[in-house]
Amino acid sequence: RSLQDTEEKSRSFSASQADPLSDPDQMNEDKRHSQGTFTSDYSKYLDSRRAQDFVQWLMNTKRNRNNIAKRHDEFERHAEGTFTSDVSSYLEGQAAKEFIAWLVKGRGRRDFPEEVAIVEELGRRHADGSFSDEMNTILDNLAARDFINWLIQTKITDRK
């Protein structure tokens, strides 16, 4: 699985036209430095990224494997501008556990046994009434609504 030529989550923003040396962003840097916001803050940032990145990787893996015709149709509809509303409708009716399972579903047990095993274990523990630490970690890091919004904003395929 390549990490190359895959899109990270893209956000809408206006790029600064200012010269970097007069960029207002840089004027805040002295403040940040004086407050000592260095690697300890970066560690927290990385903690928050980890769960998101894993889901992004799963989605890119699904895309690159291109092993489900249904998913291909969804990509096409994304290009036509209808995918976002479809995802919204679908996710509104799904529990977080089912959504994670949906991401992994169909990837093939032989290719990705670890992720499939994780989801199956989550399902078993959920059925037992003992919700998993793993799921709690994910849900703690990503509130369901924020997660849905993040997914919708994610550029799922790079259509260059």
Epitope: L3, Q4, E8, S10, F13, F54, E115, I118
Partner: antibody
Framework: QVQLVESGGGVVQPGRSLRLSCAAS????????MHWVRQAPVKGLEWVAF????????YYADSLKGRFTISRDNSKNTLYLQMNSLTAEDTAVYYC????????????WGQGTLVTVSS | DIVMTQSPDSLAVSLGERATINCKSS????????????LAWYQQKPRQPPKLLIY???IRESGVPDRFSGSGSGTDFTLTISSLQAEDVAVYYC????????FGQGTKLEIK
């Protein structure tokens, strides 16, 4: 294909400043976080700084003591590193590196630009 | 910061033979929520930048020959080249990306 080209290195006296640039092409620059990593003969590979795709997050190595500033211009597909109050310990090859979809993992590196701090 | 320590510092192996490089982290880089080890391996040839070989301890990056493999979990990791080729002469670095990124000191691989 992805290309990262650094420039701006050279010989500079202690206490002076230098600005490095990294011109990116072959990928959607505004969608990826970017890093500076340096390599000195004595200290090996050392992470320097990170900036997120939308500039909302910037982080630095503690060892820099606030002397360096990372920035980017997404309209120009260019990453920058402003280096102030340089010392001999800053002598190194400076690489810009593209972050993969996994945070703090570098899937593409530039060829590097040599910064030599010497009187 | 997490300290990465590689061994050996240098290694000489005959062409066609197996080369093994070890990497130890000062604390675990295993993320329990997805059972992934946030450990990468890079290859750096003379006068070139590092090149990503392996991430998540064992996943080969696209285009990397299958003679390269990674293994290990928690704090102990290994990069193995099953059959050394002349073009594999380089310095190899491990890097953890679980926290603020840090690199091992490098292992220089040469032909015996």
């Amino acid at each position: 294909q992805v290309q990262l080209v650094e420039s701006g290195g050279g010989v500079v006296q202690p206490g002076r400043s230098l600005r490095l640039s990294c011109a990116a092409s072959g990928f959607t620059f505004s969608s990826y976080g970017m890093h500076w990593v340096r390599q000195a003969p004595v200290k090996g590979l050392e992470w320097v700084a990170f900036i997120s795709n939308d500039k909302s997050n910037k982080y630095y190595a503690d060892s820099l003591k606030g002397r360096f500033t990372i920035s980017r211009d997404n309209s120009k597909n260019t990453l920058y590193l402003q280096m102030n109050s340089l010392t001999a310990e800053d002598t190194a090859v400076y690489y810009c590196a593209k972050e993969s979809i996994l945070a703090a993992l570098f899937d593409y590196w530039g060829q590097g630009t040599l910064v030599t701090v010497s009187s | 910061d997490i300290v990465m320590t590689q061994s050996p510092d240098s290694l000489a192996v005959s062409l066609g033979e197996r080369a093994t490089i070890n990497c130890k982290s000062s604390q675990s880089v295993l993320y329990s929520s997805n059972n992934k080890n946030y450990l990468a391996w890079y290859q750096q040839k003379p006068r070139q930048p590092p090149k990503l070989l392996i991430y998540w301890a064992s996943i080969r990056e696209s285009g990397v020959p299958d003679r390269f493999s990674g293994s290990g979990s928690g704090t102990d990791f290994t990069l193995t080249i099953s059959s050394l080729q002349a073009e594999d002469v380089a310095v190899y670095y491990c890097q953890q990306f679980y926290s603020v990124p840090t690199f091992g000191q490098g292992t220089k691989l040469e032909i015996k």
